[in-house]
């Protein structure tokens, strides 16, 4: 058993048929000695009396908020949560496996630049009685500070018969140098509590590996005289690290017809303009990627040819 | 520690070209190592990230763009630095700063070159003949060093008398390639910045 936060404790349980469970001794936080009674989860039924209460925790129903009282007055609370281990593996029932970039990916993170700011998100089908708390650091043995906000519900989607909920959190490394060469990864730890179930999820990454620039901005077309060609121009996204001559991007320009089956013409360039042939009903799209370190491409910025 | 905007130096352009070749070569070599040594811990997640130049050179700080010198986190990111005199930042001694930066890059290349050559000599003794260093990568390191045109003492190639442990050597190769790729990215950024200045 360990303390998650004040008055909240996690009981780690090996889960198998006929498991003996864990004996937990709760102590009422009071100088009083006599006349103390214990109840569970808002029920008035008395479970026992005395300054301590010993319980055998075997399953979820044995957890909950234990309260000690004296003469109708609440003295203290202890909320017990369960962390379930089956066949040596901690449960991962609360979050959905996103399977990208590999199996058992529960947390996904992205950064728009090298400032040390990043966003992580996760998915669940659970809609109620759910809380998350997020901690992060650079390195684990001698951790350096990363500050994370509160996790918030950022999207809801319908997937078949199920509703899926996306939560996200923003974190910022306390003292980040955009030009630094990372040797210690960022560690992100998410505590998830659903009803009386506790689970934790972790992700470890270098900012350089989770970079995904915003799409190029101010995408414009300039027709060239007496030609089907157009000059496409764009700018670096505002969120990208500066100076741009140091943090350079490379771009992919794509001409795509109305039908998805039509052949796509693609051009790669380090410049912020390109000359392409504009077909009728086609659209021109541009995306960006770090020029020197191949992490993710940005989403496309698009304009119609007409 | 910083790179103020300088008047274009025609000598920079070959360096930019060579640094791009370097990044391409080290990236290809790393990809080849990851594929060939698929049953060894050779991915970014599996290896320890070591920097053989740590406390010996200070490329990130010496080559910091002027725009980032206002960021205290960039100035404090390492104990060792070429510039301890703060007035250098204020006086904007461009050529002096650039010389420090480029000599730091040169020292990096020299250290990696020695490590890679020593390692290749060991790998050539491996009866499995599983992996060797790409001669193109070694050549590109040499070309960039020549383009940087610094004269410094030749570092003798490390020779070892004991029987090489090929498993350890291959893991060390992965560690070295990962670190060198990260340094090659920094070098490319620096050359691009200098080229644009």
């Amino acid at each position: 058993i360990w303390e998650l936060k004040k008055d909240v404790y996690v009981v780690e349980l090996d889960w198998y048929p006929d498991a003996p469970g864990e004996m937990v001794v709760l102590t009422c936080d009071t100088p009083e000695e006599d006349g103390i009674t214990w109840t569970l989860d808002q029920s008035s039924e008395v479970l026992g009396s005395g300054k301590t209460l010993t319980i055998q925790v075997k399953e979820f129903g044995d957890a909950g908020q234990y309260t000690c009282h004296k003469g109708g007055e609440v003295l203290s609370h202890s909320l017990l949560l369960l962390h379930k281990k089956e066949d040596g593996i901690w449960s991962t029932d609360i979050l959905k496996d996103q399977k990208e970039p590999k199996n058992k990916t529960f947390l996904r993170c992205e950064a728009k630049n090298y400032s040390g700011r990043f966003t992580c998100w996760w998915l669940t089908t659970i809609s109620t009685d759910l809380t998350f708390s997020v901690k992060s650091s650079r390195g684990s043995s001698d951790p350096q500070g990363v500050t994370c906000g509160a996790a918030t519900l950022s999207a809801e989607r319908v997937r078949g018969d199920n509703k899926e909920y996306e939560y996200s959190v923003e974190c910022q490394e306390d003292s980040a140098c955009p030009a630094a060469e990372e040797s210690l990864p960022i560690e992100v730890m998410v505590d998830a509590v659903h009803k009386l179930k506790y689970e934790n999820y972790t992700s470890s990454f270098f900012i350089r590996d989770i970079i995904k620039p915003d799409p190029p901005k101010n995408l414009q077309l300039k027709p060239l005289k007496n030609s089907r060609q157009v000059e496409v121009s764009w700018e670096y996204p505002d969120t990208w690290s500066t100076p741009h001559s140091y943090f350079s991007l490379t771009f992919c320009v794509q001409v795509q017809g109305k039908s998805k089956r039509e052949k796509k013409d693609r051009v790669f360039t380090d410049k912020t303009s390109a000359t392409v042939i504009c077909r009728k009903n086609a659209s021109i799209s541009v995306r960006a990627q770090d020029r020197y370190y191949s992490s993710s491409w940005s989403e496309w910025a698009s304009v119609p040819c007409s | 520690r910083n790179l103020p905007v300088a008047t274009p130096d025609p000598g920079m352009f070959p360096c930019l070209h060579h640094s791009q070749n370097l990044l391409r070569a080290v990236s290809n070599m790393l990809q080849k190592a990851r594929q060939t040594l698929e049953f060894y811990p050779c991915t970014s997640e599996e290896i320890d990230h070591e920097d053989i130049t740590k406390d010996k050179t200070s490329t990130v700080e010496a080559c910091l763009p002027l725009e980032l010198t206002k960021n205290e986190s960039c100035l404090n990111s390492r104990e060792t630095s070429f510039i301890t005199n703060g007035s250098c930042l204020a006086s904007r001694k461009t050529s002096f700063m650039m010389a420090l930066c480029l000599s730091s890059i040169y020292e990096d290349l020299k250290m990696y070159q020695v490590e890679f050559k020593t390692m290749n000599a060991k790998l050539l003794m491996d009866p499995k003949r599983q992996i060797f260093l790409d001669q193109n990568m070694l050549a590109v390191i040499d070309e960039l060093m020549q383009a940087l045109n610094f004269n410094s003492e030749t570092v003798p190639q490390k020779s070892s008398l004991e029987e090489p442990d090929f498993y350890k050597t291959k893991i060390k190769l992965c560690i070295l390639l990962h670190a060198f790729r990260i340094r090659a990215v920094t070098i490319d950024r620096v050359m691009s910045y200098l080229n644009a200045s």
Epitope: D41, K58, G61, G64 | -
Partner: nanobody, 124 residues
Framework: QVQLVESGGGLVQAGGSLRLSCAAS????????MGWFRQVPGKEREFVAV????????YYPDSVKGRFTISKDSAKNTVYLQMNNLKPEDTAVYYC?????????????????WGQGTQVTVSS
Amino acid sequence: QVQLVESGGGLVQAGGSLRLSCAASGRTFETIAMGWFRQVPGKEREFVAVIRGSGVATYYPDSVKGRFTISKDSAKNTVYLQMNNLKPEDTAVYYCAATTNRFKNTDYTTYDYWGQGTQVTVSS
């Protein structure tokens, strides 16, 4: 999902005893409490006994206290209701139920899963 199957109901004389069993299957580890409720035609379902978890707490209404005992065999995922000193007013359909809710474990409206029910008739 949790599936519940009751057994052990029947006809018994007043003052007699019966033991009801409820076998649970499926995602039983999600359940917080299991209980027995009864219903007489035309009346609301009534709480009879609830066991919380593996037995940290048991709840009974005054009408059955001292006569009925709820217990659980966690290994077999089975809940039992031992009914002694039965009275004609105990005649009803007895339902086994399971809840994933922490609170109001004596309120049948908070229960997620129900068995099909077993008839208990007490003759005088």
